[in-house]
């Protein structure tokens, strides 16, 4: 039975040209995290294997930086970066947990961080 929950940075906004940290945290389970995948819509941005470390897609390596921790930093943001991002935790023996973050990249300086929320 999967008992864990993923806490994420929720709905967030950031300024065009700036950077943002996407962060997820898995709690309430003793399952071993074997890998975390970061995805944007239908694209795989990066993976972080518990043993082998980070592997960033060449398509994004200029604008994606690993960390902090299991999080992902997006740099040089453009309006096209607006959308859904997913952290996918592969665990043993539980299976897969998925967290969702919505990022809005704004033209102006009115960007504010949204509240944290949980996905069971």
């Amino acid at each position: 039975m999967m008992t864990g929950t993923i806490e994420t940075t929720g709905n967030i906004s950031a300024e065009k040209g700036g950077s943002i940290i996407l962060q997820c945290h898995l709690s309430s389970t003793t399952a071993q995290v074997t890998q975390v995948n970061w995805e944007q819509q239908d694209q795989l941005l990066a993976i972080c294997n518990a043993d082998l470390g980070w592997h960033i897609s060449p398509s994004f390596k200029d604008r994606v930086a690993p960390g902090p921790g299991l999080g992902l930093t997006l740099q040089s943001l453009t309006v096209n970066d607006t959308g859904e991002y997913f952290c996918i935790y592969h665990t043993y023996p539980d299976g897969t947990y998925t967290g969702r973050i919505f990022l809005e990249v704004l033209e102006s300086s009115v960007a504010e961080h949204g509240a944290r929320f949980q996905i069971p």
Partner: antibody
Framework: EVQLVESGGGLVQPGGSLRLSCAAS????????MSWVRQAPGKGLELVAT????????NLADSVKGRFTISRDNSKNTLYLQMNSLRAEDTAVYYC???????WGQGTTVTVSS | DIQMTQSPSSLSASVGDRVTITCRAS??????LAWYQQKPGKSPKLLIY???TRQSGVPSRFSGSGSGTDFTLTISSLQPEDVATYYC?????????FGGGTKVEIK
């Protein structure tokens, strides 16, 4: 030049033990996760074990859990695979592999037979 | 575990031919796929990673494509030194798994 040189293979009886070693050079060993991948005669590839750069985390294939242990000594630039309770189906060439499988050693042959 | 199925299991082609090898994943793996070349009696060598990125030093006649569940390795003009067995591998989720291999021979 990246080099991975495996040793320690040989002929062993079922139930026996072997310890494989992999001497690494040409890169900063302590910065890379490492793996052991095996290939049974005439067969495909199977990931057997992985270990974090610091050695603090390891993962083993279900087929070897409880029998094999992966470890490393970063001061010696060496990766190990301790194989206990060996079975005939463990007969294979064992490869030492760097990181996300970008460099492979030449392999060492393990034969389990009575 | 994710199953990786390669086809064909073997093929024979003439020097200069265009050769295509396919790899199918049992579930969506996005672009988390690598291709390896193993020449007879040698260890595997990384050719392609992230489905389409050539490893440094790999000849341009080798190319990879695909996303999701269906992937292709293409040798645009087969050379005698390309005689080998080719394997795909997924690293979308653990345990990482390999395809069964495709043996390429020269007619």
């Amino acid at each position: 030049e990246v080099q991975l040189v495996e040793s320690g293979g040989g002929l062993v009886q079922p139930g026996g033990s072997l310890r494989l070693s992999c001497a690494a050079s040409g890169f900063t060993f302590s910065s890379y996760g490492m793996s052991w991948v095996r290939q049974a005669p005439g067969k495909g590839l199977e990931l057997v074990a992985t270990i974090k750069s610091s050695g603090g985390s390891t993962n083993l294939a279900d087929s070897v859990k409880g029998r094999f242990t992966i470890s490393r000594d970063n001061s010696k630039n060496t990766l190990y695979l301790q194989m206990n309770s060996l079975r005939a189906e463990d007969t294979a060439v064992y490869y030492c592999v760097r990181g996300y499988f970008d460099y492979w050693g030449q392999g060492t042959t393990v034969t389990v037979s009575s | 575990d994710i199953q990786m199925t390669q086809s064909p299991s073997s093929l024979s082609a003439s020097v200069g031919d265009r050769v295509t090898i396919t790899c199918r994943a049992s579930q969506d793996i996005k672009t988390a796929l690598a291709w390896y070349q193993q020449k007879p009696g040698k260890s595997p060598k990384l050719l392609i990673y992230w489905a389409s990125t050539r490893q440094s030093g790999v000849p341009s006649r080798f190319s990879g494509s695909g996303s999701g569940t269906d992937f292709t390795l293409t040798i645009s003009s087969l050379q005698p030194e390309d005689v080998a067995t080719y394997y795909c591998q997924q690293y979308y989720s653990t345990p990482y798994t390999f395809g069964g291999g495709t043996k390429v021979e020269i007619k």
